[in-house]
Interface confidence: low
Amino acid sequence: QAGPLPKPTLWAEPGSVISWGNSVTIWCQGTLEAREYRLDKEESPAPWDRQNPLEPKNKARFSIPSMTEDYAGRYRCYYRSPVGWSQPSDPLELVMTGAYSKPTLSALPSPLVTSGKSVTLLCQSRSPMDTFLLIKERAAHPLLHLRSEHGAQQHQAEFPMSPVTSVHGGTYRCFSSHGFSHYLLSHPSDPLELIVSGSLEDPRPSPTRSVSTAAGPEDQPLMPTGSVPHSGLRRHWE
């Protein structure tokens, strides 16, 4: 065969963002000539795992029965054919949620906003965190507030939206994380529904409580755990 072997495809089911204790399956798909599959995890001894291909030999399954901190991280896979090892797959970032208590998500000045006006979604944690992630249900990508290099420890991140349009309406959640491990996220915040009305004459009642004044971190209660959405959440680190 001329040239390097094509790189395999790596993905996770039911997704790459998994709550603590849940099962996840990592799949590596190569070619029908594959004899063996290897999965490497960044900062772990290589190979992290080896598997024989499943018939018809073009893919292998790597099972994680119960998600923990140890499994969170960046993975690549390879396959071996009679002519040698393939190129590495594109990386898969496996993220675990539930590592920290959930943050509080609120809308300032209110979750009921008139089209054309401004609103800020505020994600607050009780303990200092470095990174805050905002997701919207059914959105392709999360909005992300990256780790700040400031000599300060963040308890909150602001996600300003201006001018607001009907596209901004929907249900949001946020997560918090420490910069030293981008692959461990908090439990998700309680959902916040942002309602965009067409005009001031047509207000609709808001289903969520608004926090109109910002509280310090000492005022933020630790919340019980919540459920985790898997769909539509991908990591985009700048």
């Epitope: 200092p128 700040s148 400031h150 420890q153 602001e158 971190p217």
Partner: antibody, heavy 121, light 112 residues
Framework: QIQLVQSGPELKKPGETVKISCKAS????????MNWVKQAPGKGLKWMGW????????TYADDFKGRFAFSLETSASTAYLQINNLKNEDMATYFC??????????????WGAGTTVTVSS | DVVMTQTPLSLPVSLGDQASISCRSS???????????LHWYLQKPGQSPKLLIY???NRFSGVPDRFSGSGSGTDFTLKISRVEAEDLGVYFC?????????FGGGTKLEIK
């Protein structure tokens, strides 16, 4: 009352080590990063870096990598700056400062009174 | 590193006068999150710096309203509308948008 209390003045010889303390009170120590700022006699202010008081992770400005070390004693709400192998150019007043300006919604800024380090043979 | 250039170096004023200090940065101080982390401090002899203005134009708690900050991008100004005796000292601008944080060289406000 929110305050940072720094240790007293130090007189050291070149090549020696000095360790300056900064004790926080009146707020939750682990909620805010601790910055260190150098001011040489008659000169301006120079940011040395900071330490994350929650994780203990230090960040040093390029000019302060190598002989300088930030550390914590979290149980005592105290941050430390250690300077090894002292040189004449280390003679300065060192301030600890706990600063939070990340968002527009609330703000926090408190500085210690400064610790003067004199280096003389 | 971001260089902060303050002018003038020395500013002689009479009590009750208006004073204006300029601070220019070598690159934009607009952070990727939209905030501009440009701050003003006053340092009196033998004391630590005291924060006056944070993020361009926000007065820190307890700072009199005769102090105001303005500017954007790379050019910033601190104004004191009516100078009082307690305002004398060295004023520093400071940026914390980019690491490392940097300070201006200082402007000494003194009696004419």
């Amino acid at each position: 009352q929110i305050q940072l209390v720094q240790s007293g003045p130090e007189l050291k010889k070149p090549g020696e080590t000095v360790k300056i303390s900064c004790k926080a009170s009146g707020y939750t120590f682990t909620n805010y990063g601790m910055n260190w700022v150098k001011q040489a006699p008659g000169k301006g202010l120079k940011w040395m870096g900071w330490i994350n008081t929650y994780t203990g992770e230090p960040t040093y400005a390029d000019d302060f990598k190598g002989r300088f070390a930030f550390s914590l004693e979290t149980s005592a709400s105290t941050a430390y700056l250690q300077i090894n192998n002292l040189k004449n150019e280390d003679m300065a007043t060192y301030f600890c400062a706990s600063i939070y300006y990340h968002t527009s919604l609330w703000y926090f800024d408190v500085w210690g009174a400064g610790t003067t380090v004199t280096v003389s043979s | 590193d971001v260089v902060m250039t303050q002018t003038p170096l020395s500013l002689p004023v009479s009590l009750g006068d208006q004073a204006s200090i300029s601070c220019r940065s070598s690159q934009s101080l607009v952070h990727s999150n939209g905030n501009t982390y440009l701050h003003w401090y006053l340092q009196k002899p033998g004391q630590s710096p005291k924060l006056l203005i944070y993020k361009v134009s926000n007065r820190f708690s307890g700072v009199p309203d005769r102090f105001s900050g303005s500017g954007s991008g790379t050019d910033f100004t601190l104004k004191i509308s009516r100078v009082e005796a307690e305002d004398l000292g060295v004023y520093f601008c400071s940026q914390s948008t980019h690491v490392p944080y940097t300070f201006g060289g200082g402007t000494k406000l003194e009696i004419k």
